[in-house]
């Protein structure tokens, strides 16, 4: 359970100080220096790719 007053972001998202809202951590693959990426705990999984044609 979250402490009172904490950022209300769900798993896989992180609070953006600049936008004042939660943002999807998946976008940090493309823009890793966005402010909210600091709060993204684990690297999002790479997109699944077939290993054969």
């Amino acid at each position: 359970e979250q402490a009172p007053g904490t950022a209300p972001c769900s798993r896989g998202s992180s609070w953006s100080a600049d936008l004042d809202k939660c943002m999807d951590c998946a976008s940090c693959r493309a823009r890793p220096h966005s402010d909210f990426c600091l709060g993204c705990a684990a690297a999002p999984p790479a997109p699944f790719r077939l290993l054969w044609p």
Partner: antibody
Amino acid sequence: QVQLVQSGGGLVKPGGSLRLSCAASGFTFTSYAMSWVRQAPGKGLEWVSAISGSGGSTYYADSVKGRFTISRDNPKNTLYLQMNSLRAEDTAVYYCARVRANYYYGMDVWGQGTLVTVSS
Amino acid sequence: LTQSPGTLSLSPGERATLSCRASQSVSRLTWYQQKPGQAPRLLIYGTSSRATGIPNRFSGSGSGTDFTLTITRLEPEDFAVYYCQQFRNSLLTFGGGTKVEIT
């Protein structure tokens, strides 16, 4: 208990290099961003750098960009600050700190600090 | 971030009002306390939420560019330096600090 233990400070000549370490214990290291903050003698706090839990996102103050590198070894629960091209104005006590994203990026656990002196 | 006053001289039991002003609008602000020879201690996060273990005589308020830390009745252990901090444009920034000293 939750703690951060720092090492690696000391005396270095201008232009030299130094690596600071911060060993974390008592919490899931990968779940937290980490940061370095410094304090010159008799002065206020100055943020230096921060890194996300995965290590994939790094951030630097303009005053150290291109000279300092923040990194982390998650299996070893350790945060690092590699400092190159050191200047006299980098002389300070350096603190590592745990960043709480859900606390709107407040830093809730701090290391004991380590003194870096840059002097010839 | 500009903190004022630089030094506040008060007596135990008095009320302390510390100001932090940002040059651009800030969504949330953090406050720390630091005593000589010690690491900073998180007091207030998200402008007004007290960190774990912080007594309720400490409170934070404000919005936009003007923020305040209030200590309702100063205890002897509250005499220290207080810093505000923001996170904006992917940069963490501290104010210059306010020293609360015994008059």
